[in-house]
Interface confidence: low
Amino acid sequence: GLECDGKVNICCKKQFFVSFKDIGWNDWIIAPSGYHANYCEGECPSHIAGTSGSSLSFHSTVINHYRMRGHSPFANLKSCCVPTKLRPMSMLYYDDGQNIIKKDIQNMIVEECGCS
Amino acid sequence: GLECDGKVNICCKKQFFVSFKDIGWNDWIIAPSGYHANYCEGECPSHIAGTSGSSLSFHSTVINHYRMRGHSPFANLKSCCVPTKLRPMSMLYYDDGQNIIKKDIQNMIVEECGCS
């Protein structure tokens, strides 16, 4: 997946830091105080639809076959710049009681972006 | 995730059968001859952005916090109807060396759709 560098407007991964205080979650998240969540942004022209960096999936490849042939209904389906690879991160937080939990939380960090 | 029923235009999962013959892959895929791949379609108005049925991820929850508060650059980010849960399927196929392989291929079937 591409890293956004300001030179291209093609689907890429943009760096973004989330502060848990900003979103009001510092009452239950002990550590970290924030993290680099990142996000996806950019255009998905038809020639790169279904390309998802190293996470190109079988499904998007198949659908793109139909899309590129103008097969209804795929010809009109918008291809979107979305996370194609997310990774977990370890967090220390209070659970539903007052127990302190250390756990790897899934889908926290965007690693790669691609066109759906 | 919603199943498309023709009554709503909100992001939902649409049934779709893929024929490997249709896309010219029947020369290397032995079995099955096709499968229900499904796909995602529908609108993602701002109030349902970041809702992905049972797969709502930590990341999309966080980003939606910023989006709903009109935080630049998220206010202008398009929310898209995309697969949020895919499952594998077993396939019998020829590899590059004409060996017959039986393997579970990841990300073949769309199980759930949601708004990114």
């Epitope: 979650w25 659970d95 539903d96 | 709502l56 709903m68």
Partner: antibody, heavy 122, light 108 residues
Amino acid sequence: QVQLVQSGAEVKKPGSSVKVSCKASGGTSSSYAISWVRQAPGQGLEWMGYIIPAFGTANYAQKFQGRVTITADESTSTAYMELSSLRSEDTAVYYCARPVRTYPLGKYFYHWGQGTLVTVSS
Amino acid sequence: EIVLTQSPATLSLSPGERATLSCRASQSVSSYLAWYQQKPGQAPRLLIYDASNRATGIPARFSGSGSGTDFTLTISSLEPEDFAVYYCQQDSIFPPYTFGGGTKVEIK
């Protein structure tokens, strides 16, 4: 101390709609998911859907999809549940409920409203 | 959607006795299961969350166990105030949340 205070009992005609409110006070944050759970007379508990007021994001149980609308007003810390096309089997006590933690890691319903009895009768 | 089946429907016991309530899920919910107590005319009260953790303020006589599809709520020695209806609820990570049909613990 968190308190969820619901609106009063309602009597409605079949085919009409009802809107129940739930006002949160004490240590509130709009990041908490407010759920609506109903209980028909002598029956069990049934989850209808939730809203995260911070987002306006609502998620509904398939059974109620298209008939229930959950909204929230962040400025007044109030959540609303509107159920339309009422029928006699919608006669129930409707509860709002909230976890201890903010979404998505707070999952179970620790705080409950007192319940609102909605009677559907012609 | 995951279906939770509680058994027995009714449990008739005397104060001081041990109560064992069961909740079975139609598919694995890992340890994402809670137990609630409800008395007539009152809202439910959270007793146990994540299968075995007692909620704040819940007496030690209440304990939960199990994972996957089979769960148990145990009340080691019934007090008069424990006679009520008990519900299990699953949250296998995200909604829809579902509840079991309930077990009524009544005085024998």
